[in-house]
C-alpha cells in the first residue's frame, strides 16, 4: 500500500486500565502528533481506522467491533471498552487516512487487575496536601466522558482497604473527598469507585491515587545554610585534605527548584584550575522539606588555597542566601629545642 | 452475560464435610469479591462471607469462621466454599453471589445448591 | 456486628396499591443499603443500591429512602409479579448482615 507517516509505538503513552471495567482511549494522534483535530479531519473526508497487536505477537490484526453487547466499540477518536477483559492487553494502532493521506501511531495497552485492596501494577497519580492548611479536596480523576452530566453515579472511597466513613477529619462528598485538616496520618491510597448505569448494564470505574501531605507554604522559609557557619574553622596544613559541607534546609514549596552550589573566589569550581570535588546528598522529612549537602574537597591543599574564599550558595522561590566558609592555615606548632634555647639567651 | 452457575443438591450425614461450587461466566472472575450467602428452609438470608479470587483475600462472618472455608480457582472461574463437621443447623441453601464491582451489593447470584444434613 | 430489623415479617395488599416496607439499622449505617426480592421460586435479584438508586432493569414502581438508621423500600403500584420476601442489607461494615425478610402477599 501507498506509503503512511508513521509515529511508532507511542511508548510515552503507556494506557493502564482495569480488568472488568470500561475504558475509552483517546486516538493519541489528534493530542500530540497531528495539528488538527478529530472533527476537522472527518469533514475533510478522512477516517479512522484501528487495529491492534495482541500481547507476545507480531501480527496486525483489525479490532473485532461485532462482539456481544458491543464490548469494543469506536465513536468518533476513541476506543471503548464496555468492560475491558485481561487479553485486551496490546498495542493498539490508530491510522487516519484516505486515498492521498495516512498516518498512524500505536500505543500500549496494558489491562491489570487489582487485589483486594485495590493494590495492582498501576502507575499512582501522586496529590500533595499541604499540612494543616485547611479544607482541601482530592477529586476522582479521569472519569470524564464515561457518562453524561445526566446520570448521577454512586461514588465510594477508601482509604486503602477501609471505606471511608466516620473518619475524623475526612469527608466524602460525591466526586469529592474533603480533608478538614491534613495531617501525616493522611499520607496513603485513595480509592474512588464510580458505578453507573447504561443500556441496562452497571459499570464500575475504580480510580486509585497517592496522597501526600507536605509542608505549609505557611511555614516556608527562605533556604537556611547550617554548615558553613561562624562557629567552625577549617584550619588545615599545606598537603592535607580539604573537606568543607554546605548543609541547607530548604522548605517544601511546591514546584520549586532548589539549589546548592560553591564558588571559590567567586567562580564557579568547573571554572578554575584547582582539583576540587563536589558531592551531594539529598534526603527528605516526612513533609518533604529538603536537606541538601554538598562537600566541597581537595585533597591535598596548597597554602594558595587555604588563602581563597569558599561560599556556599542556596537558592529557592523562597529567596537566595550564602555563606563563607572560614579557612586558615594552621601556624605550625613551635619547635621545643629552638624555643627553649631562644629563651636561655642560647646562640 | 453474567453467569453463576452451581453445583448440585448434596444430601450428606451429620459430621461430614461437603464443598459446593459456583462456576462463573462473562466477566473478570479475578477483579470482584464472591459471596457465600445462607438461607434456612423458612428462614432470611445470611451472609456467610466472601473471597477475592485475584489475591485469595477472605472475610467471614464470626459464626462461620471454621465452619466454612472459601477458597477460588483462576483457571477454571470457580468459587468454592467447604463446610466442615455439618448438623441438622447445617441444612440450608447456599447461594453464591458476585458483588459488581468493588461495592458491597450483590448483583448477580446463583441459583442455590441445597445441602441436606440427615443421618 | 450491626442488626438489621424488619418489623413487618408479612405484609398484605391489593394490586395497585402503595406499598411500604421498613428496615432499621442498631447503628447509623450512612446510606450504605440495599434492598434485595427474593420470588417464590427461590431466585434473588437486586433491586436498589445505596438507599435510592434503582439497578439497571428494575421497574420505576421501586424506590428507596432513608438516612441514618430508618430506611425503606416503596412500591408505587402493586403488580402481581411484585409478589416476593423483600431483604435489606447494610454494607456499611462488615460482617455484611441482612434484615429478617417481609414477605409480601396480594390481599
Known amino acids: 500500500s501507498e506509503r503512511c507517516d508513521d509515529w511508532g509505538l507511542d511508548t510515552m503513552r503507556q494506557i493502564q486500565v482495569f480488568e472488568d471495567e470500561p475504558a475509552r482511549i483517546k486516538c493519541p494522534l489528534f493530542e500530540h502528533f497531528l495539528k488538527f483535530n478529530y472533527s476537522t479531519a472527518h469533514s475533510a473526508g478522512l477516517t479512522l481506522i484501528w487495529y491492534w497487536t495482541r500481547q507476545d505477537r507480531d501480527l496486525e490484526e483489525p479490532i473485532n467491533f461485532r462482539l456481544p453487547e458491543n464490548r469494543i466499540s469506536k465513536e468518533k477518536d476513541v476506543l471503548w471498552f464496555r468492560p475491558t477483559l485481561l487479553n485486551d492487553t496490546g498495542n493498539y494502532t490508530c491510522m487516519l487516512r484516505n486515498t492521498t493521506y495516512c498516518s498512524k501511531v500505536a500505543f500500549p495497552l496494558e489491562v491489570v487487575q487489582k487485589d483486594s485492596c485495590f493494590n495492582s501494577p498501576m502507575k499512582l497519580p501522586v496529590h500533595k496536601l499541604y499540612i494543616e492548611y485547611g479544607i482541601q479536596r482530592i477529586t476522582c480523576p479521569n472519569v470524564d466522558g464515561y457518562f453524561p452530566s445526566s446520570v448521577k453515579p454512586t461514588i465510594t472511597w477508601y482509604m486503602g482497604c477501609y471505606k471511608i466513613q466516620n473518619f475524623n477529619n475526612v469527608i466524602p462528598e460525591g466526586m469529592n473527598l474533603s480533608f478538614l485538616i491534613a495531617l501525616i496520618s493522611n499520607n496513603g491510597n485513595y480509592t474512588c469507585v464510580v458505578t453507573y448505569p447504561e443500556n441496562g448494564r452497571t459499570f464500575h470505574l475504580t480510580r486509585t491515587l497517592t496522597v501526600k501531605v507536605v509542608g505549609s507554604p505557611k511555614n516556608a522559609v527562605p533556604p537556611v545554610i547550617h554548615s558553613p557557619n561562624d562557629h567552625v574553622v577549617y584550619e588545615k596544613e599545606p598537603g592535607e585534605e580539604l573537606l568543607i559541607p554546605c548543609t541547607v534546609y530548604f522548605s517544601f514549596l511546591m514546584d520549586s527548584r532548589n539549589e546548592v552550589w560553591w564558588t571559590i573566589d567567586g567562580k564557579k569550581p568547573d571554572d578554575i584550575t584547582i582539583d576540587v570535588t563536589i558531592n551531594e546528598s539529598i534526603s527528605h522529612s516526612r513533609t518533604e522539606d529538603e536537606t541538601r549537602t554538598q562537600i566541597l574537597s581537595i585533597k591535598k591543599v596548597t597554602s594558595e588555597d587555604l588563602k581563597r574564599s569558599y561560599v556556599c550558595h542556596a537558592r529557592s522561590a523562597k529567596g537566595e542566601v550564602a555563606k563563607a566558609a572560614k579557612v586558615k592555615q594552621k601556624v605550625p606548632a613551635p619547635r621545643y629545642t629552638v624555643e627553649l634555647a631562644c629563651g636561655f639567651g642560647a646562640t | 452475560q453474567v453467569q453463576l452457575q452451581q453445583s448440585g443438591p448434596e444430601l450428606v450425614k451429620p459430621g461430614a464435610s461437603v464443598k459446593i461450587s459456583c462456576k462463573a461466566s462473562g466477566y473478570g472472575f479475578s477483579s470482584s469479591w464472591m459471596n457465600w450467602v445462607k438461607q434456612r428452609p423458612g428462614k432470611g438470608l445470611e451472609w456467610i462471607g466472601r473471597?477475592?479470587?485475584?489475591?485469595?483475600?477472605?472475610n467471614y462472618y464470626g459464626e462461620f469462621k471454621g465452619k466454612a472455608t472459601l477458597t477460588a480457582d483462576k483457571s477454571s472461574s470457580t468459587a468454592y466454599m467447604q463446610l466442615n463437621s455439618l448438623t441438622s443447623e447445617d441444612s440450608a441453601v447456599y447461594f453464591c453471589?458476585?458483588?459488581?464491582?468493588?461495592?458491597?451489593?450483590?448483583?448477580?447470584w446463583g441459583q442455590g445448591t441445597l445441602v441436606t444434613v440427615s443421618a | 456486628d450491626i442488626q438489621m430489623t424488619q418489623t413487618t415479617s408479612s405484609l398484605s395488599a391489593s394490586l395497585g396499591d402503595r406499598v411500604t416496607i421498613s428496615c432499621s439499622a442498631s447503628q447509623g449505617i450512612s446510606n450504605y443499603l440495599n434492598w434485595y426480592q427474593q420470588k417464590p421460586d427461590g431466585s434473588v435479584k437486586l433491586l436498589i443500591y445505596?438507599?435510592?438508586t434503582l439497578h439497571s432493569g428494575v421497574p420505576s414502581r421501586f424506590s428507596g429512602s432513608g438516612s441514618g438508621t430508618d430506611y425503606s423500600l416503596t412500591i408505587s403500584n402493586l403488580e402481581p409479579e411484585d409478589i416476593a420476601t423483600y431483604y435489606c442489607q447494610q454494607y456499611s461494615y462488615l460482617p455484611w448482615t441482612f434484615g429478617g425478610g417481609t414477605k409480601l402477599e396480594i390481599k
Open positions: 445505596y438507599t435510592s
Open positions: 453471589a458476585r458483588n459488581d464491582g468493588y461495592p458491597a451489593w450483590f448483583t448477580y
Open positions: 473471597i477475592y479470587p485475584g489475591d485469595g483475600n477472605t
